[in-house]
Amino acid sequence: LQDPCSNCPAGTFCDNNRNQICSPCPPNSFSSAGGQRTCDICRQCKGVFRTRKECSSTSNAECDCTPGFHCLGAGCSMCEQDCKQGQELTKKGCKDCCFGTFNDQKRGICRPWTNCSLDGKSVLVNGTKERDVVCGPSPADLSPGASSVTPPAPAREPGH
């Protein structure tokens, strides 16, 4: 025997008080699947959260963060303060990256500069708080006379 509630589409609930007819979800609630016996309360984007997508009878609201903050967690469950490039967020707020570290984004932590010598390379451009170092060719590649390419001999003219 088929459950009469299975005929109730998304956006409704199966109303046991009214002979299991399909009743529309109340305002500020939704059902995203059919056959539900209740609707779900819409998420409210308040405070630092702002509404990215309004709640409808068939889908929940979606939030993002107000300027100066960014989303964290599944479905933007949290908003975290932005910092400037060259900074990281600590318990005491935004702090400049320590020497030898950088952050090129408004979020996340300061990361150590690349150690060029580990790859046998030299530092071509020094790092800053906002940018990683740029590694260049290895020191051996740069020493004079190290080139293995010999220029071609000049072509001789016939009869010489």
């Epitope: 500020n28 539900q36 609707c39 779900d40 309360i41």
Partner: nanobody, 122 residues
Framework: EVQLLESGGGLVQPGGSLRLSCAAS????????VGWVRQAPGKGLEWVSA????????YYAESVKGRFTISRDNAKNTLYLQMSSLRAEDTAVYYC???????????????RGQGTQVTVSS
């Protein structure tokens, strides 16, 4: 026991006005989410308007915005729906509804009353 008693319906010409009342007992309208749903002939239920939360924020279906006004009289424990610029498509049985929030997080509503018939016709 929760009881809802609707009144104020009737026959009205297009462009006319009506004021529906819902006398509530068994709960306090000022402390609950309450509203109006309607059922047109041969159609399903449709939410018309609601007062949500004790702060009194209001909801209106797009089809009635600017024409219907929901209000409540806390002293009389009564909910009202002032309907103006009525159209033939507003013809329906209007029910007073109380939104019910369940412990598991679900939302439903009950319409305990018999409803009041509104007919818009010339």
């Amino acid at each position: 026991e929760v009881q809802l008693l609707e009144s104020g319906g009737g026959l009205v010409q297009p462009g006319g006005s009506l004021r529906l009342s819902c006398a509530a007992s068994g709960f306090t309208v000022s402390a609950e989410d309450v509203g109006w749903v309607r059922q047109a002939p041969g159609k399903g239920l449709e939410w018309v308007s609601a007062i949500l939360d004790s702060g009194g924020s209001t909801y209106y279906a797009e089809s009635v915005k600017g024409r219907f006004t929901i209000s409540r009289d806390n002293a009389k424990n009564t909910l009202y729906l002032q309907m103006s610029s009525l159209r033939a498509e507003d013809t329906a049985v209007y029910y007073c509804a109380r939104v019910v929030y369940h412990a598991g997080g679900g939302v439903t509503y009950d319409t305990r009353g018999q409803g009041t018939q509104v007919t818009v016709s010339s």
